[in-house]
């Protein structure tokens, strides 16, 4: 088309999380995903600084189709601010990334005591279950809910049956995984929620448990019921 | 049944490289972070890699760290362990290993399941 | 790293007898999940390690109820109440909370 245009960010939600702890060895991959007319060309600094090859061992890749600078085997030298710079005749746009790397024991996830926390609501109702995570490692995290089949929790293998609610994608953030909504509660949704976190050391979870309780003025409406016949 | 077979294992001199390798079955390979560890001859266990159920982590026992990497192929359910720089001390039976898994552990997370072996021998 | 001391090296026992390995950790081993994450195996001659016991207390499947883990934090036993001659081999405790993933120097089990 001939709509001239200075670049713009095509998709800021893969750039939400600026702040990247990565544990020493693994591969880090940044990305600047933007369009613009004509196409713009993307470069990239380190600490404010043209970032060159021979700046680490190894060097780097950059993917100018898919927007991404992507560091192999990072090292502590590679800590600092990575900025992506995304220019046209028309304009310039930047964002910057700061790279930290860990050097630190990685460890089983850690979830914090007590939550998530026992919750009451009525028939109707909203609740919500939270999980705070700390893992070093990326963890995976699922929200699973506990039910019954033909009235028993368990199979005959003795394996609890299991639900998954909610698990971290493509298209969710760590904040959105850690909060289990249930909206206009029933009887049904009544049970043991866990939060489960995993990452290559182990998994850990923590588990609590939903009451649903009738909604107020339920009973007398029932009660009340005949007199409304006649 | 599940099952870890690794292969590779050889005779080598120290400074060479070796790949070794562990083919996962009976599983869902893709769902389990998967781990190395070593044995010398006579000697106790020695933890040397683990890599995630979708390899985007790795990590490496302080002694093999900048000589071997640690790789899975998911489409082929395998396990690899590339050796460089090999030292008279990597000398051991190495040891593929289930890790940790996916979802909710009905058991324990890992470490279950071993595979038998394959002997490295580096020698001059 | 998590050093994991484990004693004695080695147990010659009378059959029908029990025994009893201790490992110590340098550090606590009960994870914010409640759970204490250690692991006994035996490594039988020629062979690769098999599970036994599983966070802190759980028997593996298919593991004989002789065999029992117990302990608190950083202090842990392994327990054989009647010692069989199939038990002999290398024993050995992991911990399993982070890494590098440590072992036990391993116990020696012996059939007098």
């Known amino acids: 088309s001939n709509n001239k245009r200075a670049p713009y960010w095509t998709n800021t939600e893969k750039m939400e999380k600026r702040l990247h702890a990565v544990p020493a060895a693994n591969t880090v991959k940044f990305r600047c995903p933007a369009g613009g007319n004509p196409m713009p060309t993307m470069r990239w600094l380190k600490n404010g600084k043209e970032f060159k090859q021979e700046h680490r061992i190894g060097g780097y890749k950059v993917r100018n189709q898919h927007w991404s600078l992507i560091m192999e085997s990072v090292v502590p030298s590679d800590k600092g601010n990575y900025t992506c710079v995304v220019e046209n005749e028309y304009g310039s746009i930047n964002h910057t990334y700061h790279l930290d790397v860990v050097e630190r024991s990685p460890h089983r996830p850690i979830l914090q005591a007590g939550l998530p926390a026992n919750a009451s609501t009525v028939v109707g109702g909203d609740v919500e279950f939270v999980c705070k995570v700390y893992s070093d490692a990326q963890p995976h995290i699922q929200w699973i809910k506990h039910v019954e089949k033909n009235g028993s929790k368990y199979g005959p293998d003795g394996l609890p049956y299991l639900k998954v609610l909610k698990a971290a994608g493509v298209n969710t953030t760590d904040k959105e995984i850690e909060v289990l909504y249930i909206r206009n509660v029933t009887f049904e949704d009544a049970g043991e929620y866990t939060c489960l976190a995993g990452n290559s050391i182990g998994i850990s979870f923590h588990s609590a448990w939903l009451t649903v309780l009738p909604a107020p003025g339920r009973e007398k409406e029932i009660t009340a019921s005949p007199d409304y016949l006649e | 049944e599940v099952q870890l077979l690794e292969s590779g294992g050889g005779v080598v001199q120290p400074g060479r490289s070796l790949r070794l390798s562990c083919a996962a079955s009976g599983f869902t390979f893709s769902s389990y972070a998967m781990h190395w560890v070593r044995q010398a001859p006579g000697k106790g266990l020695e933890w040397v890699a683990v890599?995630?159920?979708?390899?985007?982590?790795?990590y490496y026992a302080d002694s093999v760290k900048g000589r071997f990497t640690i790789s899975r192929d998911n489409s082929k359910n395998t396990l690899s362990l590339q050796m460089n720089s090999l030292r008279v001390e990597d000398t051991a039976i190495y040891y593929c290993?289930?890790?940790?898994?996916?979802?909710?552990?009905?058991?324990?997370?890992?470490?279950?399941?071993w595979g038998q072996g394959t002997m490295v021998t580096v020698s001059s | 790293d998590i050093v994991m001391t484990q004693t004695p090296l080695s147990l010659s026992v009378t059959p029908g007898q029990p025994a009893s390995i201790s490992c110590r950790s340098s550090r606590s081993l009960l994870h914010s999940d409640g759970k204490t994450y250690v692991y006994w195996y035996v490594q039988k001659s020629g062979q690769p390690p098999q599970l036994l016991i599983y966070?802190?207390?759980n028997r593996f499947s298919g593991v004989p109820d002789r065999f029992s883990g117990s302990g608190s934090r950083t202090d842990f036993t392994l327990k054989i109440s009647r010692v069989e001659a199939e038990d002999v081999g290398v024993y050995y405790c992991?911990?399993?909370?982070?890494?590098?993933?440590?072992f036990g120097g391993g116990t020696k089990v012996e059939i007098k």
């Open positions: 290993v289930r890790g940790a898994g996916h979802g909710f552990p009905t058991g324990p997370d890992g470490f279950d399941i």
């Open positions: 890599i995630s159920y979708d390899g985007s982590n790795k």
């Open positions: 966070e802190l207390s």
């Open positions: 992991m911990q399993y909370v982070e890494a590098p993933l440590t």
